[in-house]
């Protein structure tokens, strides 16, 4: 006895695809909600870096800036900033004028 009537395989396929589509649409709408809740990046009081150490600037409640400093100091183990290509150097705040990445201190 056949497990299902003719065409049941394609029905299953269709419902599977529909399920995937629903899942993706749900994810997409989640992302859109998330995106609209994100505030634009706040400008810094300075156009170039003022911190010697690695810095992560995050926005707290009501837009207050919180600074999380990851200083490379012995005897702590140095932590690589993902994909920064700036191991053990002083890094400027990433801003429109300083550009991405590291600045090595110039010596005159």
């Amino acid at each position: 006895h056949p497990l299902g009537s003719p065409g049941s395989a394609s029905d299953l396929e269709t419902s599977g695809l529909q399920e995937q589509r629903n899942h993706l649409q749900g994810k997409l709408s989640e992302l859109q909600v998330e995106q609209t809740s994100l505030e634009p990046l706040q400008e810094s009081p300075h156009p170039t870096g003022v911190w010697k150490s690695r810095e992560v600037a995050t926005e707290g409640i009501r837009g207050h800036r919180k600074m999380v400093l990851y200083t490379l100091r012995a005897p702590r183990s140095p932590k690589m900033v993902q994909g920064s290509g700036c191991f053990g150097r002083k890094m400027d705040r990433i801003s429109s004028s300083s550009g991405l990445g590291c600045k090595v201190l110039r010596r005159h």
Epitope: S44, H46, P47, V50, K52, R65, S96
Partner: antibody, heavy 119, light 106 residues
Framework: QVRLQESGPSLVKPSQTLSLTCTVS????????VTWVRQAPGKAPEWLST???????FYNPTLKARLSITKDSTKSQFSLSVSSVTSEDTAMYYC?????????????WGRGLLVTVSS | YELTQPTSVSVALEQTAEITCQGD??????VAWYQQKPGQAPMKLIY???ERPSGILDRFSGSSSGKIATLIISGARTEDEADYYC??????????FGSGTRLTVL
């Protein structure tokens, strides 16, 4: 040649609002950081306010309620107003091209304007 | 947030003067140094702890270790008599000037 010139009253009465203007030449205010700094007689300079290149304004938290900074790029001017002044606001007021940062060398200061608050 | 400097420093002519600046964030934040002569606006001598803007004499140098930054003036001259201020930032990145040091060249 880059130049900044402060202008405004040299004498203001207590409780009044002090309004100062900085007129710049030799550069455009568009895309620039501009700052107001003051220095009371015999004291250290004090950062008052910075307008970032994108228009965000930062104020000294202890004075924030009394300060206002505006920029008119078409007139090459930026202004500072200080409300409810007292004798403590007697100082030399400087406008500066830059954010007055420890991280760069771009400062250009005006000559300053001495403002006295007295009745 | 405060940056503490000695009120005054004296140095003999042609000798080396050192002016210190102490602050809790100075191991993480850069320091700049300004010279101010009577009737003039402050002029930046050093930024990023030890960098010199163009046009500043190499007699002026800077260093930083831990929570103390130092301005070094080698071969001091009479024209170096002035007030010197350090500058750094607080945790919100707002600029803060030091209390100031009067340099006397003997």
């Amino acid at each position: 040649q880059v130049r900044l010139q402060e202008s405004g009253p040299s004498l203001v009465k207590p409780s009044q609002t002090l309004s100062l203007t900085c007129t710049v030449s030799g550069f455009s205010l568009i895309g620039e950081y501009v700052t107001w700094v003051r220095q009371a007689p015999g004291k250290a300079p004090e950062w008052l306010s910075t307008m970032a290149s994108g228009g965000t304004i930062f104020y000294n938290p202890t004075l924030k309620a009394r300060l206002s900074i505006t920029k008119d790029s078409t007139k090459s001017q930026f202004s500072l107003s200080v409300s409810s002044v007292t004798s403590e606001d007697t100082a030399m007021y400087y406008c500066v091209r830059s954010s007055v940062s420890p991280g760069d060398d771009r400062d250009v200061w005006g000559r300053g304007l001495l403002v006295t608050v007295s009745s | 947030y405060e940056l503490t400097q000695p009120t005054s420093v004296s140095v003999a002519l042609e000798q080396t003067a050192e002016i210190t600046c102490q602050g809790d964030l100075l191991d993480d934040a850069y320091v700049a140094w300004y010279q101010q002569k009577p009737g003039q606006a402050p002029m930046k001598l050093i930024y990023k702890d030890s960098e010199r803007p163009s046009g500043i004499l190499d007699r002026f140098s800077g260093s930083s270790s831990g929570k103390i930054a130092t301005l070094i003036i080698s071969g001091a001259r009479t024209e170096d008599e002035a007030d010197y201020y350090c500058l750094s930032v607080d945790s919100s990145e707002y600029s803060v000037f030091g209390s100031g040091t009067r340099l006397t060249v003997l």
